[in-house]
Interface confidence: low
C-alpha cells in the first residue's frame, strides 16, 4: 500500500454534508507519545486562521480548538481514546450544520461547534507522527 507524504495538504471547498476521510497509523508506539494533527485552514498558508484544529495525543487525550487572528481560542479536551496502539484507524470528519463531528472507525466520538464559517476553509493539513494511507474529501 502506497503512503502519502506527511505533512499532507490539500485544497478543499467544504459545506454542510462534506466529509473528510483519513486513514492512517501511528508511526511509533504510544509509549513514545506520537501525535496526529489535522488543521482546517482559512488560507493556503500554514500561519493562517484555523477553523478546526484536531490533535490526538495517542494514548492520552484529544484536543480541539480554533485559531483566529493568530490567537488560539478556548480549547476543548476529550479523554475518549478509541485509537489502538499500532493499529490503523479511519478518521472521518463530518461537516454538520452546527458543528464538526469526528468519527473513529465508524463511531462518533468528538464534536466541535463551528466558530468560523465552514465556507472560509480553503486547505486541510494532516501531519505529525503518522503514516498516511488515505485522504479524501467528499461533498
Amino acid at each position: 500500500m502506497s503512503l502519502l507524504s506527511v505533512p499532507h495538504t490539500e485544497s478543499v471547498s467544504l459545506s454542510t454534508g462534506s466529509t473528510v476521510t483519513i486513514e492512517a497509523r501511528p508511526l511509533v508506539c504510544f509509549f513514545n507519545e506520537p501525535h496526529l494533527q489535522v488543521d482546517f485552514h482559512t488560507e493556503m498558508k500554514e500561519d493562517s486562521d484555523i477553523a478546526f484544529h484536531f490533535q490526538v495525543y495517542f494514548g492520552n487525550r484529544v484536543v480541539m480548538n480554533s485559531r483566529e487572528y493568530r490567537t488560539w481560542k478556548e480549547e476543548v479536551e476529550s479523554k475518549n481514546m478509541p485509537f489502538q496502539d499500532g493499529q490503523e484507524f479511519e478518521l472521518r470528519i463530518l461537516v454538520l450544520e452546527d458543528k464538526y463531528q469526528v468519527m473513529v472507525n465508524g463511531q462518533a466520538y468528538y464534536n466541535f461547534n463551528h466558530r468560523i464559517p465552514v465556507s472560509s476553509v480553503k486547505m486541510v493539513q494532516v501531519w505529525r507522527d503518522i503514516s498516511l494511507t488515505k485522504f479524501n474529501v467528499s461533498n
Epitope: L4, S5, P7, H8, T9, E10, M44, E46, M123, Q125
Partner: nanobody, 121 residues
Framework: QVQLVESGGGLVQAGGSLRLSCAAS????????MAWFRQAPGKEREFVAA???????TYADSVKGRFTISRDNAKNTVTLQMNSLKPEDTAAYHC???????????????WGQGTQVTVSS
C-alpha cells in the same frame, strides 16, 4: 531523483505576459505533483500555483484569473502562463516537485534554482 530547470523569466512592463517553463529530468515526472512558488527579496517564499498528477490545479488568490499552470507529462514539463502582470509579481519563481499536492514548501522534495521575473511600472 528529479532535477528541475526553470526558464522564461525576464523583464516585462506592467500588463504584459510571460510564460515560465520548468523542465524535469527523470522518468517519474508524472508521479509528482508540481508547483510554482515565488520569493521576492527580503520576503518569505510564497505559493503561486500547483497542479496534481492528473492535472487538477489551484492558485493563490493574488494570481487567480491571471496565471495558468499546466503540465505535459509526455515532455516532462510544467508551465506557468502569466498574464496581466503587476509590479508586485516581481520575484524569483521556483518550480517544485513533490509527492503531495500542497501549498506548503516543505512538502516538496525537489526544487529548481529559479528564474527571475521583473515587472516594471
Amino acid at each position: 531523483q528529479v532535477q528541475l530547470v526553470e526558464s522564461g523569466g525576464g523583464l516585462v512592463q506592467a500588463g504584459g505576459s510571460l510564460r515560465l517553463s520548468c523542465a524535469a529530468s527523470g522518468r517519474t515526472f508524472s508521479t509528482y505533483s508540481m508547483a510554482w512558488f515565488r520569493q521576492a527579496p527580503g520576503k518569505e517564499r510564497e505559493f503561486v500555483a500547483a497542479i496534481t498528477r492528473s492535472g487538477g490545479n489551484t492558485y493563490a488568490d493574488s494570481v487567480k484569473g491571471r496565471f495558468t499552470i499546466s503540465r505535459d507529462n509526455a515532455k516532462n514539463t510544467v508551465t506557468l502562463q502569466m498574464n496581466s502582470l503587476k509590479p508586485e509579481d516581481t520575484a524569483a519563481y521556483h518550480c517544485a516537485a513533490g509527492g503531495t499536492y500542497s501549498f506548503v514548501p516543505r512538502s516538496y522534495n525537489y526544487w529548481g534554482q529559479g528564474t527571475q521575473v521583473t515587472v516594471s511600472s
